[in-house]
């Protein structure tokens, strides 16, 4: 935040900061969630051997996790700010049900799983503010989400471990792509 004339509240050597711009706030928030995902992945990898499974084996799943594609306009070639922003918000909204699923999947990192879920809600809010004039954002149906959640929770232990690992890996990749794209906006 700027200093009022005649005020000085900073370290003498430090340049003064402005209030965070919306982009900086979003950037910090994504870093926060990514750090949370790292902590959750660490617990998952310590608990099961999913992290050693080949990408091909893990790809053989019926989870419809959001993923960035060329048409979404988030990559450097064919970058389109509006299309990309819609994709990021829509993708995060779709991830919410999977983050809800993660809530009972951790023991020592329970608080972090909650923090990742909560922070994703905040991130969506920040992004929706940035995308005020975009109306192409579709919210997943609550009933669809509820039945998907029930289905995921009914899986056997091995499949639940795999699902947890896949969600975390996909969410990390989605956020990293989002972070790169948002830095171009």
């Amino acid at each position: 935040a700027p200093v009022l004339p005649g005020e000085d509240s900073k370290d003498v050597a430090a340049p003064h900061s402005q209030p965070l711009t919306s982009s900086e706030r979003i950037d910090k928030h994504i870093r926060y969630i990514l750090d949370g995902i790292s902590a959750l992945r660490k617990e998952t990898c310590n608990r099961s051997n999913m992290c050693e499974s080949s990408k091909e084996a893990l790809a053989e799943n019926n989870l419809n996790l959001p993923k960035m594609a060329e048409k979404d306009g988030c990559f450097q070639s064919g970058f389109n700010e509006d299309t990309c922003l819609v994709k990021i918000i829509t993708g995060l909204l779709e991830f919410e049900v999977y983050l809800e699923y993660l809530q009972n999947r951790f023991e020592s990192s329970e608080e972090q799983a909650r923090a990742v879920q909560m922070s994703t809600k905040v991130l969506i809010q920040f992004l929706q503010k940035k995308a005020k004039n975009l109306d192409a954002i579709t919210t997943p149906e609550p009933t669809t989400n509820a039945s998907l959640l029930t289905k995921l929770q009914a899986q056997n232990q091995w499949l639940q471990d795999m699902t947890t690992h896949l969600i975390l890996r996909s969410f990390k990749e989605f956020l990293q792509s989002s972070l790169r794209a948002l830095r171009q906006m």
């Epitope: 370290d11 928030h29 926060y32 972090q112 503010k129």
Partner: antibody
Framework: YPQLVESGGGLVQPGGSLRLSCEAS???????MSWVRQAPGKGLEWVGS????????YYNTKFIDRFTISRDNSKNTLYLQMNSLRAEDTAVYYC?????????WGQGTLVTVSS | AIQMTQSPSSLSASVGDRVTITCQAS??????LAWYQQKPGKAPKLLIY???DRYPEVPSRFSGSGSHEDYTLTISSLQPEDFATYYC?????????FGQGTKLEIK
């Protein structure tokens, strides 16, 4: 476990020093952090903040000569070094994540300055 | 430093009442203002940021409004768990400053 846990509070004599710690979960590694204090029965007062790498620190002018904020990211810990303590520094000290507004807070640690 | 004048300093109300707390800054804030709720012995909890954005999972009965120097927190229908102290905070300028608080008590 809670995401932010302050410690190091206690009874100290006027003129004494104290170092408060705020142990943070790994999520706070890339975040600006602030210290905020609250005297018994009084309102909230911002002490200062620090950027993720610890390069830039911002202080409330009131504390710039006596208080120093630092962090050790390898230990995921934020510190508040308080020197030349006075009776009016008696307060609960909170650490919080700083997005300009504070969206995550520790539970606080009580510092009592008294002879 | 920016002065934040919160009013009233205390307020008695009943469950179901509509309550308004105001915060006046000594300088233009560009909506860079937050509202917090604090219960005895607990840390403050963020309710509203950027003047009127409700933090996720904060009940919809809480709303923020205002511009320039004048801001308002409204609780549309008081619930038993809302009896607490409320603070505004400006983050337009450093040092960040808080209002002196409004203690909301049961009538």
């Amino acid at each position: 476990y809670p995401q932010l846990v302050e410690s190091g509070g206690g009874l100290v004599q006027p003129g004494g020093s104290l170092r408060l710690s705020c142990e943070a979960s790994v999520l706070f590694k890339h975040q600006d952090m602030s210290w905020v204090r609250q005297a018994p029965g009084k309102g909230l007062e911002w002490v200062g903040s620090i950027d993720p790498r610890g390069d830039h620190k911002y202080y409330n002018t009131k504390f710039i000569d006596r208080f120093t904020i630092s962090r050790d990211n390898s230990k995921n810990t934020l510190y508040l070094q308080m020197n030349s303590l006075r009776a009016e520094d008696t307060a609960v000290y909170y650490c919080a994540r700083d997005l300009d507004f504070m969206d995550e807070w520790g539970q606080g640690t009580l510092v009592t300055v008294s002879s | 430093a920016i002065q934040m004048t919160q009013s009233p300093s205390s307020l008695s109300a009943s469950v179901g009442d509509r309550v308004t707390i105001t915060c006046q800054a000594s300088y233009w804030l560009n909506s860079e203002l937050a509202w917090y709720q604090q219960k005895p012995g607990k840390a403050p909890k963020l309710l509203i940021y950027d003047g009127d954005d409700r933090y996720p999972e904060v009940p919809s009965r809480f709303s923020g409004s205002g511009s320039h120097e004048d801001y308002t927190l409204t609780i549309s229908s008081l619930q038993p768990e809302d009896f607490a102290t409320y603070y505004c905070q400006q983050y337009r300028y450093t040092p960040y400053t808080f209002g002196q608080g409004t203690k909301l008590e049961i009538k």
